[in-house]
Interface confidence: medium
Amino acid sequence: ASVATELRCQCLQTLQGIHPKNIQSVNVKSPGPHCAQTEVIATLKNGRKACLNPASPIVKKIIEKMLNSDKSN
């Protein structure tokens, strides 16, 4: 059974390589009863969704950059 069928997680797997310029926004979902793991869901500029690895240094930088740009807006 996939993760999605075992818990109500939205990230079945994570996209490894993604360029920050392709990302429009990022949503970080904290663990909860619906899903035991932190999930990072990116909305891409083409409108599609992708799950990113929250442990990846690049993803951490992307999240930090997105959060900072939100604060400055």
Partner: antibody, heavy 125, light 107 residues
Framework: EVQLLESGGGLVQPGGSLRLSCAAS????????MSWVRQAPGKGLEWVSA????????YYADSVKGRFTISRDNSKNTLYLQMNSLRAEDTAVYYC??????????????????WGQGTPVTVSS | DIQMTQSPSSLSASVGDRVTITCRAS??????LHWYQQKPGKAPKLLIY???NLESGVPSRFSGSGSGTDFTLTISSLQPEDFATYYC?????????FGQGTKLEIK
């Protein structure tokens, strides 16, 4: 054709029990989460419970926690809702719904995209 | 629990009108929101998933938008078969919750 068919509803006295069934066909039942949603007469939709594809994870609304049990038999393509200690406020039409929808290879969404016709439950003395 | 509030509760409109229904979440739910249509005596039907995606077979006059806490369902030109009750639903976290519904009636 993808189909869900509920059964088991009826009239029961307060404090009594009832077991609802939902027979699924037309899709790989074991791959998808399922939910029960109810609708009291003249009222809106209220989510009751959900279960993962394998049956390993279950979720309940506070209003039914400890009284209702959701389960599934993937070999029979059937979803169940065991309802105990029934109250007048449990009177409603009960729908089972499939939570479908793989959107992208790296992202999954849960939407109730297929519904049964509903089975009425009346709790009254 | 996440509360979903729809407005208006009821709405009278005419065939051909443009209609907008709003749904507000008590906390941010990203775009983890769906819209359903229900006709009397029938089961609900999925219209829009993930805030803005049209379910297969649903007419293009239906559209959804929003993210975070504020969402809208728009019907660009009402048809006779659109008179029904509409519900939003969040799946950001359990318990899953629905809005109280918006009843769309003929003026």
């Amino acid at each position: 054709e993808v189909q869900l068919l509920e059964s088991g509803g009826g009239l029961v006295q307060p404090g009594g029990s009832l077991r609802l069934s939902c027979a699924a066909s037309g899709f790989t039942f074991s791959e998808l989460s399922m939910s029960w949603v109810r609708q009291a007469p003249g009222k809106g939709l209220e989510w009751v419970s959900a279960i993962s594809g394998s049956g390993g994870s279950t979720y309940y609304a506070d209003s039914v926690k400890g009284r209702f049990t959701i389960s599934r038999d993937n070999s029979k393509n059937t979803l169940y809702l065991q309802m105990n200690s029934l109250r007048a406020e449990d009177t409603a039409v009960y729908y089972c719904a499939r939570e479908g929808g793989r959107l992208e290879p790296y992202y999954y969404y849960y939407a109730m995209d297929v519904w049964g016709q509903g089975t009425p439950v009346t709790v009254s003395s | 629990d996440i509360q979903m509030t729809q407005s208006p509760s009821s709405l009278s409109a005419s065939v051909g009108d443009r209609v907008t229904i709003t749904c507000r979440a008590s906390q941010s739910i990203s775009d983890n929101l769906h819209w359903y249509q229900q006709k009397p005596g029938k089961a609900p039907k999925l219209l829009i998933y993930d805030a803005s995606n049209l379910e297969s077979g649903v007419p293009s006059r239906f559209s959804g938008s929003g993210s975070g806490t504020d969402f809208t369902l728009t019907i660009s030109s009402l048809q006779p078969e659109d008179f029904a009750t509409y519900y939003c639903q969040q799946y950001y976290s359990t318990p899953l919750t629905f809005g109280q519904g918006t009843k769309l009636e003929i003026k």
